[in-house]
């Protein structure tokens, strides 16, 4: 029950996160005009990843797309790439996780397959969230750098009678949406990975039956040779025949692929 809840919650949190990443990527307000000493502005500039906009006091808003690809800063291209990778990975993760949900029955899909898919989607969500956080952080860093550069420029060359007011840009709403969304996707991914551990079929907890032969003792372990699904503690199909009889609890456990949470 707890596993299903964790998986379901992870899915929902990731879904909200990915929706947020998509929203942030599409938003125009990645950077907004800094109203440092002029809170009342007649012309307000803001920029997104795909276009820049100007909102006039009259209410008219005009947006222009960045129609050039080569003329754009490399950093902006990198941010675009990170956000798109994040969305693509997140979308694939959502698709995989739908089939992995314990509450959804698809044919005769085994729990082992569901666990595998849950882990896959969890990792995808984690990477998706990290891509979004990285993209937003790179853009924020770019803004901070430009902000201080334009601030320095504002106080140079003011000797003449005519002042040229340099437009400075600060963090837009999309950055905060992106950070929160990336964080949610990351949390959702971690929850999916945690849920995966509970979904992985465990060994039946029997005590090993010991057969004492006259010559030497051999312990028969139930499920000694598993089908190579990659699940369960005996992932390497290693024979569990050793010199003497042991109980199940004494057997060396090998790290499964679900231990990296």
């Amino acid at each position: 029950m707890a596993v299903t809840a964790c998986q379901g919650l992870g899915f929902v949190v990731s879904l909200i996160g990915i929706a947020g990443i998509i929203a942030a990527t599409c938003m125009d307000q990645w950077s907004t005009q800094d109203l440092y000493n002029n809170p009342v502005t007649a012309v307000f500039n803001y920029q997104g990843l795909w276009r820049s906009c100007v909102r006039e006091s009259s209410g008219f808003t005009e947006c222009r797309g960045y129609f050039t690809l080569l003329g754009l800063p490399a950093m902006l291209q990198a941010v675009r790439a990170l956000m798109i990778v994040g969305i693509v990975l997140g979308a694939i993760g959502l698709l995989v996780s739908i089939f992995a949900l314990k509450c959804i029955r698809i044919g005769s899909m085994e729990d082992s397959a569901k666990a595998n898919m849950t882990l896959t989607s969890g990792i995808m969500f984690i990477v998706s969230g990290l891509c979004a956080i990285a993209g937003v952080s790179v853009f924020a860093n770019m803004l901070v750098t430009n902000f201080w550069m334009s601030t320095a420029n504002m106080y140079t060359g003011m000797g003449g009678m005519v002042q040229t007011v340099q437009t400075r840009y600060t963090f837009g709403a999309a950055l905060f949406v992106g950070w929160v969304a990336g964080g949610l996707t990351l949390i959702g991914g971690v929850m999916m990975c945690i849920a995966c551990r509970g979904l992985a079929p465990e060994e039946t907890n029997y005590k090993a039956v010991s057969y004492h032969a006259s010559g030497h003792s051999v312990a028969y372990k139930p499920g000694g040779f598993k089908a190579s699904t990659g699940f369960g503690s005996n992932t390497k199909n290693k024979k569990i025949y050793d010199g003497g009889a042991r109980t199940e609890d004494e057997v060396q456990s090998y790290p499964s692929k679900h231990d990296y949470v």
Epitope: N38, A42, N45, E56, S57, S58
Partner: antibody
Framework: EVMLVESGGGLVKPGGSLKLSCAAS????????MCWVRQTPEKRLEWVAT????????YYPDSVKGRFTISRDNAKNTLYLQMSSLRSEDTAIYYC???????????WGQGTSVTVSS | DIVMTQSPASLTVTAKEKVTMSCRSS????????????LTWYQQKPGQPPKLLIY???TRESGVPDRFTGSGSGTDFTLTISSVQAEDLAVYYC?????????FGSGTKLEIK
């Protein structure tokens, strides 16, 4: 046809109050940012106040801030300017105008005259 | 506040002559976001309210004859009437639309001989 008709002007003593109205027709009033602009006897134009389409914000120059209040009634398609603590330098023709693309005042009323004198 | 300075204060010309009037702002009116200059020109005929002629420094309002042309960028702007007509007798005002408070120039009075 766009029409803006101002009313409420007149002669008032210094320190007195007056409320101007502007009736709008021929356009979707509640979609437009509206302004009051005045023209002094020396023919100088001065922006007096701006109000957003949805009544969310108002702007005033320092010369009238705290004394003048711009408001609007979108249901009645009417713009108002409440003027108090009037001074002789407030004597002017007061025009109401709509703010269009480029923040330009694209439609003007005929104006109403306000004289502040003792 | 942005100060708008118009010159000359008055002009007397003959019909069909080309006329140029100037407007200068104390700060740049060029908006970097859309590369537009937030300067407007108005025409006020005697006994009438001002009428919008040109916005964004060079965009003619609909219905305005094409003999009116606005030009300039940053702080220096010009209104040109290519062939003055008798009905162009008016005072021409420029206005800063870039930042509050919106400010107007003192006007250029155009008179016809």
């Amino acid at each position: 046809e766009v029409m803006l008709v101002e009313s409420g002007g007149g002669l008032v003593k210094p320190g007195g109050s007056l409320k101007l109205s502007c009736a709008a027709s021929g356009f979707t009033f509640n979609n437009y940012v509206m302004c009051w602009v005045r023209q002094t006897p020396e023919k100088r134009l001065e922006w007096v106040a701006t109000i957003s389409s949805g009544n969310f914000y108002t702007y005033y120059p320092d010369s009238v801030k705290g004394r003048f209040t711009i408001s609007r009634d979108n249901a009645k398609n009417t713009l108002y300017l409440q003027m108090s603590s009037l001074r002789s330098e407030d004597t002017a023709i007061y025009y109401c105008a709509s703010l269009g693309r480029g923040n330009a005042l694209d439609n003007w009323g005929q104006g109403t005259s306000v004289t502040v004198s003792s | 506040d942005i100060v708008m300075t118009q010159s000359p204060a008055s002009l007397t010309v003959t019909a069909k002559e080309k006329v140029t009037m100037s407007c200068r702002s104390s700060q740049s009116l060029l908006n970097s976001g859309n590369q537009k200059n937030y300067l407007t020109w108005y025409q006020q005929k005697p006994g009438q309210p001002p009428k919008l002629l040109i916005y964004w420094a060079s965009t003619r309002e609909s219905g305005v004859p094409d003999r009116f042309t606005g030009s300039g960028s940053g702080t220096d702007f010009t209104l040109t009437i290519s062939s003055v007509q008798a009905e162009d007798l008016a005072v021409y005002y420029c206005q800063n639309d870039y930042s509050y408070p919106f400010t107007f120039g003192s006007g250029t009075k155009l008179e016809i001989k």
